[in-house]
């Protein structure tokens, strides 16, 4: 009996120690959905064991109370409970306390206090019109219906959101309305003319922390005005034979102009500086026009017009043919962020705060989509990635603009997205030797690169052998493979790689030689030397014993008349002959092997070629060494930033003193790093190739016709005075 009591006590103690009370409800949050319900939530949302909750409320300013239960039959473990009308009346103050209960006991939350006005959420208002008011410019009047489910007496606060129809960015204006008329109005001013705006509205009681949802969007258009203005630019082309200069004028709606703005036409007038008498005018409906100007400085003016008037005048100064342009951009860097391409530059002229950015695809054909944009009070330019085509190389030039003067551009190249090349390099094997071969390959056409070629990898493999590879820089288009095996067939291909990966070129096969030209020289020398010694010995012998030599060279020929051959027996003759054969045995097979000039069947064909190639190889080796030295020197001279890649420059205005580093390898999300590297080492930026096609014209400033970027490879001599070149 005693033991039974003890056991019972132990079990009771055990049960008590194992009892797990529910967690204390915390983070109680309540919201009053006007004339719908009063809902509270809390945490924890899930309990280990089954828990039910009671929410105790005092309402009617603390004069009434009730309970909301989440019992087994209804909400179960859900940490939320709602009180419904008619016991919800506003204004009021509530206290809320949550009780959590499980099989082991009850846990009460702290008491929380709620003012309904502060937690009231009402329906969104309904916008029924967004219209311009006749005669009032740049304004829209918004009319809406106050929500039906909103306290009549209460002052409502509003947030009006608006954006232009083609923008993703909302602007907001806040205001309050005390009047309780159901139809309300608000005049939104300082908008752009003739622009479509999207509007949406939300509201809340003035004291509430909870806003209604947003109303349905409504669109309205502001009144049309005279055109806002134009951005004007030009491309200067080379002077023609007759001295006239073609200037391609281009213009577009100024930044900030209404999206809907339509011009009926454009008036252009131009004249030489200081000679307005020679003014010429043109009217066009196009957004581009080619002028043919003389060699002097010209002024060009363009206005757009519509039925309501003319835009302000856009002005452009065309410099004289021989005018020296200023240079102030010292360095430039392109880098990619998540969804943008950012170009940043450094300038030595703080007074320059306007820049013109040009960009167009670097395709083999004539630039198809030439774009340009003005940048003010910034030294960077940003474009959304989706505005540029992936896998296309873009030439980007930045011109400094100081008042009416346009300076020398600085250019770079960029891809918004690199891919693997569409084709690999076309490869050929030259100068095949016994243990060496020189591989040459052609550059992949621009249209198929799909990124900056960062290196080439040569994969080669002997028949049934192990594969080897060699990686070389992108500026090398020839490589000499060594330590190959004699008289062996090899397969080889070259892979071109961008940041995205590599593409293999054509597979070629070659066979190393069994004997080299040097070996031929050596054997020929030995044989020739042997003959020479023999001749010399013969001569010496002849000089010592002239009769013997004479006898050897001109033996006595028996007179047949005096011959006794008729008396010989046939057998004797045969014996004599056999004896002669055994005295001088000749093995014909052995002779074939030892014969110095016997060779594989293809050797004779190749011998002629390879003799030339041998000479070529020697000169190529020498050139390769000299190039290597230049490269080493260049490497020491120009320590480039890790993200700056050496690609052909694209500016046609090449500064005499500072060669430009013009192509960027663009890692994603490294703007700040690259900026540091770029701007901390401006002086160290070095070029790799400089590219130019045709005679550079001192007048040409990045002109369209000279924007083809053909690289000068393997300069044997430095082009004089035109530009400085670092041969890579």
């Amino acid at each position: 009996m005693m033991w039974a009591k003890v056991l019972w006590m132990l079990l009771l103690l055990c049960k008590l120690s194992l009892a797990v009370l529910p967690a204390k409800p915390e983070n109680i949050s309540c919201i009053f959905y006007y004339e719908e319900n009063f809902t509270c939530t809390w945490s924890p949302e899930k309990e280990a064991s089954y828990t039910w909750y009671k929410v105790k409320r005092t309402y009617s300013y603390g004069y009434k109370s009730d309970i909301c239960s989440t019992d087994n039959s209804t909400r179960g473990n859900h940490a939320s409970c709602s009180f419904l009308p008619p016991t919800i009346t506003n204004p009021d103050n509530y206290t809320i306390q949550v009780e959590a209960q499980n099989a082991d006991g009850i846990m009460k939350s702290d008491i929380t206090y709620w003012n309904l006005d502060a937690i009231m959420k009402i329906e969104p208002p309904e916008i029924f019109s967004v219209k311009s008011v006749l005669g009032i410019k740049r304004m829209l009047q918004i009319k809406w219906i106050r929500p039906v489910l909103a306290p009549h007496s209460s002052t409502l606060k509003y947030t009006l959101r608006f954006r232009t129809i083609n923008s993703a960015y909302w602007m907001e204006v806040n205001f309050t309305k005390e009047d309780i008329d159901r139809d309300e109005t608000y005049n939104l001013t300082e908008l752009q003319a003739f622009t479509e705006y999207v509007m949406t509205l939300r509201c809340a009681p003035a004291e509430s922390m909870f806003w209604s949802g947003w109303s349905q969007e409504k669109v309205g258009t502001t009144e049309e005005e005279a055109p806002y203005g134009l951005d004007l630019w030009r491309v200067l082309k080379p002077a023609m034979v007759d001295g006239r200069r073609p200037v391609q004028l281009m213009w577009k709606k100024a930044t900030g102009a209404p999206v809907l703005e339509k011009a009926l036409g454009y008036n252009i007038w131009y004249f030489p500086e200081n000679n307005t008498n020679l003014t010429e005018t043109v009217n066009t409906t196009n957004q581009t026009h080619e002028l043919y100007l003389g060699g002097k400085t010209y002024w060009v003016y363009v206005v757009s017009y519509n039925s309501l008037g003319e835009s302000p005048v856009a002005t452009l100064r065309i410099p004289a043919l021989n005018e020296k342009t200023f240079q102030c951009i010292e360095a430039m860097q392109a880098c990619l962020t998540q969804d943008q391409l950012v170009v940043e530059w450094q300038s030595s002229a703080p007074e320059v705060d306007t820049w013109m950015v040009e960009w167009f695809p670097d395709v083999d054909s004539e630039p198809s989509s030439f774009s340009w944009e003005s940048v003010s009070q910034a030294r960077n330019w940003t474009i959304q990635k989706d505005e540029l085509k992936p896998l296309w190389c873009y030439n980007i030039s930045v011109y400094p603009v100081l008042r009416d003067r346009v300076g020398q551009p600085y250019s770079t190249q960029a891809y918004v997205q690199e891919g693997i090349p569409s084709a690999g390099p076309v490869t050929q094997a030259d100068s095949i030797g016994v243990k060496t071969v020189t591989i040459t390959w052609k550059e992949i056409p621009k249209s198929k690169r799909n990124g900056f070629i960062k290196n080439y990898t040569i994969f080669y493999q002997a028949e049934d052998g192990k594969e080897f590879s060699k990686t070389v820089n992108s500026n090398i288009l020839q490589y000499r493979l060594e330590s190959l095996t004699r008289r062996t067939s090899y397969s080889l291909q070259v892979m071109a790689s961008t940041n995205a990966g590599g593409t293999n070129g054509t597979k070629i096969n070659f066979k190393t030689l069994s004997i080299s030209v040097l070996e031929i020289f050596f054997i020929t020398s030995l044989v020739g030397g042997g003959f020479l010694i023999l001749i010399m010995l013969t001569v010496a012998y002849g000089l010592k014993k002239p009769n013997k030599l004479k006898h050897l060279c001109w033996p006595d020929v028996p007179n047949p008349a005096e011959s006794s051959i008729a008396t010989w027996r046939g057998d004797d003759f045969k014996d004599k002959l056999n004896l002669k054969e055994s005295d001088d045995p000749v093995n014909m097979e052995e002779d074939q092997v030892l014969k110095p000039y016997s060779a594989p069947t293809d050797f004779i064909d190749k011998l002629v070629v390879n003799f030339e190639n041998f000479l070529e190889e020697v000169s190529t080796e020498e050139l390769g060494k000299s190039q290597e030295n230049i490269l080493k020197e260049e490497k020491n001279k120009h320590v480039t930033s890790p993200y700056c890649l050496h690609h052909p420059p694209i500016s046609t205005e090449i500064p005499q003193r500072k060669p430009q580093q013009l192509c960027s390898r663009i890692p994603e999300g490294t703007c700040s790093e690259t900026k540091e590297q770029l701007f901390s080492s401006v002086q160290s930026l070095g070029p790799d190739h400089l590219c130019e096609e045709g005679e550079p014209n001192p007048y040409l400033k990045n002109s369209v016709t000279t924007r083809e970027f053909v690289c000068l490879k393997n300069f044997k001599t430095k082009p004089k005075e035109k530009f400085s070149v670092a041969v890579a």
Partner: antibody
Framework: EVQLVESDGGLAQPGRSLKLSCAAS????????MAWVRQAPTKGLEWVAT????????YYRDSVRGRFTISRDNAKSTLYLQMDSLRSEDTATYYC???????????????WGQGTLVTVSS | DIQMTQSPASLSASLGETVTIQCQTS??????LAWYQQKPGKSPQFLIY???RLEDGVPSRFSGSGSGTQYSLKISSMQTEDEGVYFC?????????FGAGTKLELK
Amino acid sequence: EVQLVESDGGLAQPGRSLKLSCAASGFTFSDYYMAWVRQAPTKGLEWVATISYDGSSTYYRDSVRGRFTISRDNAKSTLYLQMDSLRSEDTATYYCARGPLTDWAPNWFAYWGQGTLVTVSS
Amino acid sequence: DIQMTQSPASLSASLGETVTIQCQTSEDIYSGLAWYQQKPGKSPQFLIYGASRLEDGVPSRFSGSGSGTQYSLKISSMQTEDEGVYFCQQGLKYPNTFGAGTKLELK
């Protein structure tokens, strides 16, 4: 149904004591603040004292502080008013009234007893 | 203490007439006001609280309004049973104070 029933008041001499009680029913007495309000003959209403639901807090008008004591017995659902040092100006009908459920709520009186007359006279 | 000034002290109204009683407080009581009706020989009855909230069971002809220091009780259509004395009371601060009362009679 909420009911508040005051005990009989009676006559008391100035300087003497009197204890009023109020029996509550029809609601959870221990949840509510309770109060005493008096009304002098042909005069207006005057709040006297309030006690919190658990008896831990008490509030008095200045003229009775130190003389009157409000108390409660939640087990018996009864409210008390101990009146000492009575004065003639304490003559009034004393009402027991139910106050709010919470400490932060305004002190209004939703339910009243029928009242009991206390006369202080020599 | 918060002073409660009730006006008028008395008034008489005909059946169906609209009656308004004013209550002014000496400081802002943030709608912490209640109205009571007391008939002769009876206890006061709770009518309105929170300045405008009608107590359960009170006829809808009674309504309260106001904020800050100015409050009013309106009876939209005077009935016989509406005769009595009406008191306003602030419950915001101790000591809780009542108005002197307005005596309403039927004409």
